[in-house]
């Protein structure tokens, strides 16, 4: 049993790291393969992390970490039984994945102007909760062509667009991510998607 | 938020014996040592000894060893530490802490007073 | 054993003025990992100690920036670059490395 690639990390910079790997041949990760990973400078023994599978040859492991900081680095051992397969670390600070925002909502009520809102994904005791900006993506259900990104760059969890910026009459979706500069991350998955039907009135031409 | 709550004042004969609740909530119970620590008054911090809630495995310091019993219940997330034979310099107050960066998490400590 | 060795055991201070405070071990706190395990508390009047350096030089968490670590092997050092008021009561240097022992603490009071 060997290790064809090698297990690389993520952290959502709050409670939860994901690493993935690949084994040279199928493998039962959970009943053959234990991750093991410890602060460290935490002179104790390791925590235990049971990886599921991911593809026939792939695994995946959720390490639970009750918090994180920038100083912050882990030892990461790849056990079968008694025989070590791989020993690495993991600074989760240079490896952020952040959390998804949530309640994405599409407000349309307000004058032909539509206001989305969504959460952040961090409380506010996380240092990622004043560094998040956003990249909001809207598209239309009927025309693959009609697709288009608004960065946020400021912290507010909003965005205000003009209704006329879009075809009225026909339903839109609209979805959001996140990235943090601070850390350099990767993006986070796209949140849900939310949809709504898009209309307003056509201003009055004169002649 | 990490959160170490212990249990109240004792009032122990000497010769008798104390035991001292400290139940955590917050974190991993079993993914960090507790160290218990003792402060006489108006003195220093004198560590006693750790135990591990995930395995119970114990390290008592010198001091304080054939005296000492510390021991968790997972279930409740609570570790406990007993002093026996009490004597009037056991008098301090008793501090469990968790340690991760450092000691990073402390109870709010239990006075032990030691009086015929 | 190691031997922590606080020094001075009392510190007036001026708030807005700077303050330090050393700590000397009998043996090296450099572990073979390249972190020095030297801790610092401060415990104010009827409170549970509080951590505010781990590791030499990391801040913990929500502890301000006016603090912080410095030295390497036996000697540290704590600096508070601005004392305020809140900054009083006793700090304690302690060593991680082998099994706790704790400095004898200095007391900082406002002059």
């Known amino acids: 049993m060997k290790v064809l690639q090698e297990p690389t990390c993520v952290s959502d910079y709050m409670s939860i790291s994901t690493c993935e790997w690949k084994m040279n041949g199928p493998t039962n990760c959970s009943t053959e393969l234990r991750l093991l990973y410890q602060l460290v400078f935490l002179l104790s023994e390791a925590h235990t992390c049971i990886p599921e599978n991911n593809g026939g040859a792939g695994c995946v492991c959720h390490l639970l970490m009750d918090d994180v900081v920038s100083a912050d680095n882990y030892t990461l051992d790849l056990w079968a039984g008694q025989q070590l397969l791989w020993k690495g670390s993991f600074k989760p600070s240079e490896h952020v994945k952040p959390r998804a925002p949530g309640n994405l909502t599409v407000h349309t009520n307000v004058s032909d102007t539509l206001l989305l809102t969504w959460s952040n994904p961090y409380p506010p005791d996380n240092y990622l909760y004043n560094h998040l900006t956003y990249a909001v993506n809207i598209w239309s259900e009927n025309d693959p062509a009609d697709f288009r990104i608004y960065n946020v760059t400021y912290l507010e969890p909003s965005l205000r667009i003009a209704a006329s910026t879009l075809k009225s009459g026909i339903s839109y979706r609209a979805r959001v991510r996140a990235w943090a500069q601070c850390y350099n991350t990767t993006w986070s998955e796209w949140s849900p998607s939310t949809k709504w039907h898009n209309s307003y009135r056509e201003p009055f031409e004169q002649h | 938020q990490v959160q170490l709550v212990q249990s109240g004042a004792e009032v122990k004969k000497p010769g008798a014996s104390v035991k001292v609740s400290c139940k955590a909530s917050?974190?991993?119970?079993?993914?960090?040592?507790i160290y218990w620590v003792r402060q006489a008054p108006g003195q220093g911090l004198e560590w006693m000894g750790w135990?591990?809630?995930?395995?119970?495995?114990?390290n008592y310091a010198q001091k304080f060893q054939g005296r000492v019993t510390m021991t968790r219940d997972t279930s409740i997330s609570t570790v406990y530490m007993e002093l026996s034979r009490l004597r009037s310099d056991d008098a301090a107050v008793y501090y469990c802490?968790?340690?991760?960066?450092?000691?990073?998490?402390w109870g709010q400590g239990t006075t032990v007073t030691v009086s015929s | 054993d190691i031997m922590m060795t606080q020094s001075p055991l009392s510190l007036p201070v001026t708030p807005g003025e700077p303050a330090s405070i050393s700590c000397r071990s009998s043996?090296?706190?450099?572990?073979?990992?390249?972190?020095?395990?030297l801790d610092w508390y401060l415990q104010k009047p009827g409170q549970s100690p509080q951590l505010l350096i781990y590791?030499?030089?990391n801040r913990a968490s929500g502890v301000p920036d006016r603090f912080s670590g410095s030295g390497s092997g036996t000697d540290f050092t704590l600096k508070i670059s601005r004392v305020e008021a809140e900054d009083v009561g006793v700090y304690y240097c302690?060593?991680?490395?082998?099994?706790?022992?704790f400095g004898g603490g200095t007391k900082v009071e406002i002059k």
């Open positions: 043996q090296s706190l450099l572990h073979s990992n390249g972190y020095n395990y």
């Open positions: 590791l030499g030089s």
């Open positions: 917050g974190y991993t119970f079993t993914g960090y040592y």
């Open positions: 302690m060593q991680g490395l082998q099994t706790l022992t």
């Open positions: 802490a968790k340690r991760k960066r450092g000691l990073d998490g």
């Open positions: 135990i591990n809630p995930n395995s119970g495995g114990t």
